[in-house]
C-alpha cells in the first residue's frame, strides 16, 4: 500500500491504492495505478503548455476526467492542478487533448478567471484559468 504520508500530500484523506501489478497497469515507475489508469502528480508549477509538454515527454497526457466511477480517487484530490481540458474558440466547446468533447455532468465548470484552460479541483470541479498561469499538474496514462 502507498504510504499515507505520500498520499496525504495529494489527497484530503488516506487513500488505499494497491500496488500489485496484476490488478492494474503497467505504469511508469513511481506512478499511482488505479482502476487501469496511471497517474502522477507534479509539484513544480508550470503553465498549461509546459505542463502538457512535460506529460507528453513521458508518453502521457494531462489528466482526462472520463468516468466518476473509474476515477473516484479524484474526489479527494487536494488543491488545483492543470488537467487536459482546453477551450476551442472556433466552436466554443471544451475538449480533451485526445480530441474528445467534455461530456455533460462529468465536471462542474467554474469560471474563476477568463481563460481557455482548466484546473482540476476535488469533487469533480473544473476551474477556468488563463493558460499562462503557473500551476501544478497531473499527468495520466490510460492503460488498455
Amino acid at each position: 500500500i502507498w504510504s499515507a504520508v505520500f498520499l496525504n500530500s495529494l489527497f484530503n484523506q488516506e487513500v488505499q491504492i494497491p500496488l500489485t501489478e496484476s490488478y492494474c497497469g503497467p505504469c511508469p515507475k513511481n506512478w499511482i495505478c488505479y482502476k487501469n489508469n496511471c497517474y502522477q502528480f507534479f509539484d513544480e508549477s508550470k503553465n498549461w503548455y509546459e505542463s502538457q509538454a512535460s506529460c507528453m515527454s513521458q508518453n502521457a497526457s494531462l489528466l482526462k476526467v472520463y468516468s466518476k466511477e473509474d476515477q473516484d480517487l479524484l474526489k479527494l484530490v487536494k488543491s488545483y492542478h492543470w488537467m487536459g481540458l482546453v477551450h476551442i474558440p472556433t466552436n466554443g466547446s471544451w475538449q480533451w487533448e485526445d480530441g474528445s468533447i467534455l461530456s455533460p455532468n462529468l465536471l462542474t465548470i467554474i469560471e474563476m478567471q477568463k481563460g481557455d484552460c482548466a484546473l482540476y479541483a476535488s469533487s469533480f470541479k473544473g476551474y477556468i484559468e488563463n493558460c499562462s498561469t503557473p500551476n501544478t499538474y497531473i499527468c495520466m496514462q490510460r492503460t488498455v
Partner: antibody, heavy 114, light 107 residues
Amino acid sequence: GGGLVKPGGSLELCCKASGFDFSIYWMSWVRQSPGKGLEWIGRIYGGSSDYTAYASWVNGRFTLSRDIDQSTGCLQLNSLTAADTAMYYCVRLNPSFSRSFDYWGQGTLVTVSS
Amino acid sequence: DIQMTQSPSSVSASVGDRVTITCRASQGIFSWLVWYQQKPGKAPELLMYGASTLQSGVPSRFSGSGSGTDFTLTISSLQPEDFATYYCQQGYSTPYTFGQGTKVEIK
C-alpha cells in the same frame, strides 16, 4: 533546403514558422519516400529543446533543434543512405488535437545517390 | 511500436458514391486517431482528429467513428475533389505511426 547528397553525407533542413506562437507547439518532421507512405521522424517542443523524441529507426543519425527567437526548427541528417531518399516535411504537431499534424510545410526533396 | 493497418489499399468509386475506409491499430489507442487527405504532388492535409472531430473547414460529408482499435472514415457522397489518398495516424504514443494509405480512384 534539400537536394542531392552522396551516400554517407550530411544535410541540414530548416523550417521557419509564422502565424502562431512557436513556443507552445511542437515541431515534427515526417518523410515520404517516392510512391510510399508517411513516416514520422521525431518531434521537438517549441518552448524547450529538453523535450524531444525520435522514431527508433533514426538510430542517432538525425538530430532535431530549434531556435525560439527565430521560430525555426531544423533537422540535421547524417550518415545518409539511398533509403533516406524522400520528401521531408516539417509539420506543426498540435498536442491538443489528438497530437495531429495540423499544418504542413511544402516539403523538400532529399535525394541520396552517388 | 503501434502498427496501423488500413483497408482497402485502394478503392474505385464514382461521384456520389458512399466510401468507407477502415483503420485498425495493433493495440488500443482510445480516440487518439487522426485522418489526413493527400492529393498528388501536395502535402497531406488534416481532415479529422479525435477519431470523429472534423478539422475546421472540412465538409460535413466526411465523418469518422471508432474507439480502441477499430476506426472508420466515411465519405457520404463522393465529390470530384475527394479523389485522393487517405491516411490514418495514431497520436496515443510515440513513435507516432501512420497507416499505409488508401487511394480513392475514379471508377
